[in-house]
């Protein structure tokens, strides 16, 4: 006879596993708000900056009551996954300007990988049903000139910024509703 | 040694305007965020405003935005505080306070406060 | 905004006794953004720790801090007489910075 069965696995707490998504969250929504201050010290932005290949914001704050947590969860995912994308873009062709962003920018991008994980994790523990995988996206453009790669890093942390404040309180909100 | 020193403070009518200023010795000032923080007497701290090395992004508490400015001269190690349409409930000492070594590491260093009194 | 609360408003205890302030906060929020200070009559406040659990140059290791979430403890192991005064615990995570607003630590 084989070992005896251990103890039935138990599932953690889903309310736990949100608050460490929240923290995590909340985090790299000071880092990227510091990250973004600091780029406008160093240079200034002449006026808003888009960049077309950016996820549009997925949410205004008015329109948060109708969220459901597997939508939020999957578009916020996907919307991460793509300004990990642009954040690694920035790093490799962002130009010598951007190298005095290091190693916060660095910082960054791993804490933007480890919130990615832990949002899959969570959908994974919700029981919630799995994205399929993703299409491979077609690759950026290196920017036309420093000041290109400058004008990018604006809209990037600026994006990003955005995204993570509209997650925030949207899994705030959700906590709520678990 | 850290060093700062807030003066500016004094009396004023409700409506009235002030500037602070705070000088800075110690550090490379030009390198640290700075803040305002103050303490309306006998009361807890509150949160006035930031402002990063470079000038370029700054914060308000809502309570004194659109009538209080910061602004800084890093060539002058200085940072200061217009306070315009002063109310009575902006009356309070007022700390410059810099930050310690990097922005979530709280308020390391505050000067000793100067007083600001609005009433008529 | 994100609130504050800390409790108790006032402490009451004798020199050599530990005394555990509690700060709790309204929302989440990550360890490294809560900080503690002290504050004497007449006196600036003065950084005790840092990201929780750090103690700031020159803070005496009697003071320790512990927590995560939204519940954070200030802990002096052993009071000195010098340690009688206001405590404030303060978040730097999100914009406004918030204090609470204040534990007065007097002798019993």
């Known amino acids: 006879p084989g070992p005896p069965p251990g103890p039935p696995r138990v599932s953690p707490d889903p309310r736990a596993e949100l608050d460490s998504t929240v923290l995590l969250t909340r985090s790299l929504l000071a880092d990227t708000r510091q990250l973004a201050a600091q780029l406008r010290d160093k240079f200034p932005a002449d006026g808003d900056h888009n960049l077309d290949s950016l996820p549009t914001l997925a949410m205004s704050a008015g329109a948060l009551g109708a969220l459901q947590l597997p939508g939020v969860l999957t578009r916020l995912r996907a919307d991460l996954l793509s300004y990990l994308r642009h954040v690694q873009w920035l790093r490799r062709a962002g130009g010598s300007s951007l190298k005095t962003l290091e190693p916060e920018l660095g910082t960054l991008q791993a804490r933007l990988d480890r919130l990615l994980r832990r949002l899959q994790l969570l959908m994974s523990r919700l029981a919630l049903p799995q994205p399929p995988p993703d299409p491979p996206a077609p690759p950026l453009a290196p920017p036309s000139s420093a000041w290109g790669g400058i004008r990018a890093a604006h809209a990037i942390l600026g994006g990003l910024h955005l995204t993570l404040d509209w997650a925030v309180r949207g899994l705030l909100l959700l906590k709520t509703r678990l | 040694e850290v060093q700062l020193v807030e003066s500016g403070g004094g009396l004023v009518q409700p409506g009235g305007s002030l500037r602070l200023s705070c000088a800075a010795s110690?550090?490379?000032?030009?390198?640290?965020?700075m803040h305002w923080v103050r303490q309306a007497p006998g009361k807890g701290l509150e949160w006035v405003a930031y402002?990063?090395?470079?000038?370029?992004?700054?914060y308000y508490a809502d309570t004194v935005k659109g009538r209080f400015t910061i602004s800084r001269d890093n060539a002058k190690n200085s940072l200061y505080l217009q306070m315009n349409s002063l109310r009575a409930e902006d009356t309070a000492v007022y700390y410059c306070?810099?930050?310690?070594?990097?922005?979530?590491?709280?308020?390391?260093?505050w000067g000793q406060g100067t007083l600001v009194t609005v009433s008529s | 905004e994100i609130v504050l609360t800390q409790s108790p408003a006032t402490l009451s205890l004798s020199p050599g006794e530990r005394a555990t302030l509690s700060c709790s906060v309204s929302?989440?929020?990550?360890?490294?953004?809560l900080h503690w200070y002290q504050q004497k009559p007449g006196q600036a406040p003065r950084l005790l720790i840092y990201?929780?659990?750090n103690l700031a140059s020159g803070i005496p290791a009697r003071f320790s801090g512990s927590g995560s979430g939204t519940d954070f403890t200030l802990t002096i192991s052993s009071l000195e007489p010098e340690d009688f005064a206001v405590y404030y615990c303060?978040?730097?995570?999100?914009?406004?910075?918030?204090f609470g607003q204040g534990t007065k630590l007097e002798i019993k």
């Open positions: 306070a810099r930050e310690y070594y990097s922005y979530d590491e709280g308020f390391a260093y």
């Open positions: 110690g550090f490379t000032f030009s390198s640290y965020g």
């Open positions: 402002i990063t090395p470079g000038s370029n992004t700054i």
């Open positions: 929302d989440l929020i990550p360890s490294q953004y």
């Open positions: 990201r929780t659990s």
């Open positions: 303060q978040q730097g995570v999100d914009v406004p910075f918030t």
